[in-house]
Interface confidence: low
């Protein structure tokens, strides 16, 4: 299924490559935010036709949604836009690269809108730097799980246009003094730096400068190491339902876990009268489970359709990483149909609930 | 006791397809998965992806999602393994193999195959 | 497509010991107790040896014996005999591709 699982903070408009197939990026967005993904052909052939899906549905191209064969934008992202994003071969339906994108109230790390803090021309004659976006410059101290990617902005402006340039603990910060690099994008006037290690705490300090003046601004990097834990499951999730006789039923579970979890659907059954083995472990059917395209996103729900009155029983949601399983129950009564239950009462029985 | 009898070999020409078939005895067949492993001359063991014949559910490995089909006929206790668009490099022993973790296992990552066909040689040659 | 790496060859004299490694990753063989080994006779299908690491099945001999340490499995035969002349592979649960083989390893029995 895939090499990895990483968790980003990625600015606005900030292009995320996309992953080896089968593995799933899991992104983060502030709310306004461009999202924008990328699905570069495997080994960089042709690809073919594309279709870009979330949450198991074709996205419609429109103002706001641009879809490319290789490239999805989402401008002005929303809380609606989090979800399953995959690209997928047309014809084949192949899952070529796989994002869950997470849309946040916060803005993403300070960040700010591609393009909007370009060194601008204020129409001043001459003067020295000044930061064009101080309310994006609250955010001093900024403690990001491993692995995440960070931005660093200092929008500014002045005439003639200021430079800007990066230390880290008060010392000139480059690429060279940290495994895997940084990125320095003096247009939008920011440092990023990927798959931060506890290494990378420390202070940075964007210095902005021109020949009348010089001013600088300093962030804290807090890196908080995981403590890698079994998923969690959603309380309440499954619940217990009840349903009709010939009826739809889905089944929600909702996991959260680090490392890349596997996720079942169990239905528990009894074998020559028993629940359990000798071994103590129930008796059951796997219902559902990951295959090589199933996204996490579709296991997360089981859809059970034109329900029997054999379906009535326990169901289990299973979710298993590398440090171990958790696992959450729920119950399925199937009623009969409602005509049944007026002949039932006209026959003069008696339906217990 | 555990029997798996696969089908006999093959010769196909490149860009057709093969379908082998893997007939079980002396176990109830729908109770534990079956999967696929195949082997190319000299070389090491690949796997191919399973069936659940209970549910007729599959899994493929990456490698040959869209190219494999596994299928199950429970009345004659028969699983199939059908290879398309086949290629030189396709050339291989196929095995079909049972794995000891049953359809009602709790956990599905306990793979054991712990009975084995005797494979079936597919050559892909023009 | 090899994800776990087994040496190519061993070799040992009738009643030595050898040891035959497979190493991989933390998403495969060091995140789980779930490695198998299989023997292989030329034209023969594999056969079962050793499971969940360090079991052996009913009808294996005492002189296969399996262990583990971090990402690297371990299959030691002791008390070499000519009929253990095979090749030998081995095999995890794999966090990502669900099912792994490593490359397989020869051993040959000497003189």
């Known amino acids: 299924e895939s090499l990895g699982t990483e968790q980003r903070v990625v600015g606005r408009a900030a292009e995320v490559p996309g992953p080896e197939p089968g593995q799933q990026e899991q992104l983060v967005f502030g709310s306004g935010d461009a999202v924008e993904l990328s699905c570069p052909p495997p080994g960089g052939g042709p690809m073919g036709p594309t279709v870009w899906v979330k949450d198991g549905t074709g996205l419609v191209p429109s103002e706001r949604v641009l879809v490319g064969p290789q490239r999805l934008q989402v401008l002005n992202a929303s809380h609606e836009d989090s979800g399953a994003y995959s690209c997928r071969q047309r014809l084949t339906q192949r899952v070529l690269c796989h994002f869950s994108v997470r849309v946040t109230d916060a803005p993403s790390s300070g960040d700010d809108e591609d393009g909007e803090d370009e060194a601008e021309d204020t129409g001043v004659d001459t003067g020295a730097p000044y930061w064009t976006r101080p309310e994006r410059m609250d955010k001093k101290l900024l403690a990001v799980p491993a692995a995440n990617t960070v931005r660093f902005r200092c929008p500014a402006a002045g005439n003639p246009t200021p430079s800007i340039s990066w230390l880290k603990n008060g010392r000139e910060f480059r690429g060279e003094h940290r495994i895997g690099g940084i990125k320095l994008r003096h247009q939008q006037w920011s440092l990023v730096m990927e798959s931060v290690v506890p290494s990378d705490r420390g202070n940075y300090t964007c210095v902005v400068e021109n020949k009348f003046g010089s001013i600088r601004q300093t962030y804290t990097l807090d890196v908080l190491e995981r403590s890698p834990h079994r998923p969690i499951l959603q309380a309440g999730l499954p619940a217990n339902q009840t349903a009709v006789l010939g009826s739809d039923v889905e089944f929600h579970c909702k996991v959260y876990s680090d490392a890349q979890p596997h996720i079942q659907w169990l239905k528990h059954v009894e074998v020559n009268g028993s629940k359990v083995g000798p071994d103590g472990t129930p008796y059951v059917t796997v219902l559902k489970t990951a295959g090589a395209n199933t996204t996490d996103k579709e296991l997360e729900v089981l859809s059970l359709h034109n329900v029997t009155f054999e379906d009535a029983g326990e169901y289990t949601c299973l979710a298993g990483n590398s440090i171990g399983f958790s696992h959450h129950s729920a119950w399925l009564v199937v009623l009969p149909a409602e005509e049944e239950l007026v002949e039932a009462d006209e026959a003069g029985s008696v339906y217990a609930g | 006791q555990v029997q798996l009898v696969q089908s006999g070999a093959e010769v196909k020409k490149p860009g057709a397809s093969v379908k082998v078939s893997c007939k079980a005895s002396?176990?109830?067949?729908?109770?534990?998965?079956m999967h696929w492993v195949r082997q190319a001359p000299g070389q090491g063991l690949e796997w191919m992806g399973w069936?659940?014949?209970?549910?007729?559910?599959?899994n493929y490995a990456q490698k040959f999602q869209g190219r494999v089909t596994m299928t199950r006929d429970t009345s004659i206790s028969t699983a199939y393994m059908e290879l398309s668009s086949l290629r030189s490099e396709d050339t291989a022993v196929y095995y079909c193999?049972?794995?000891?973790?049953?359809?009602?296992?709790?956990?599905?990552?306990?793979?054991?195959?712990?009975?084995w066909g005797q494979g079936t040689l597919v050559t892909v040659s023009s | 497509d090899i994800a776990l790496t087994q040496p190519a060859s061993v070799s040992g004299s009738p009643g030595q010991s050898i040891t035959i490694s497979c190493t991989g990753t933390?998403?495969?063989?060091?995140?789980?107790?779930?490695v198998s080994w299989y023997q292989q006779h030329p034209g023969k299908a594999p056969k079962l040896m050793i499971y969940d690491v360090s079991n052996r099945p009913s009808g294996v001999s005492n002189r296969f014996s399996g262990s583990k340490s971090g990402n690297t499995a371990s299959l030691t035969i002791s008390g070499l005999q000519a009929e253990d002349e095979a090749d030998y592979y081995c095999q995890s649960y794999d966090m990502y591709n669900y099912i792994v083989f490593g490359g397989g390893t020869k051993l040959t029995v000497l003189g």
């Open positions: 069936i659940n014949p209970n549910s007729g559910g599959t």
């Open positions: 193999a049972r794995s000891m973790n049953s359809t009602m296992y709790w956990y599905l990552r306990r793979v054991l195959f712990d009975h």
């Open positions: 002396g176990y109830t067949f729908t109770s534990y998965y």
């Open positions: 933390s998403s495969d063989v060091g995140g789980y107790n779930y």
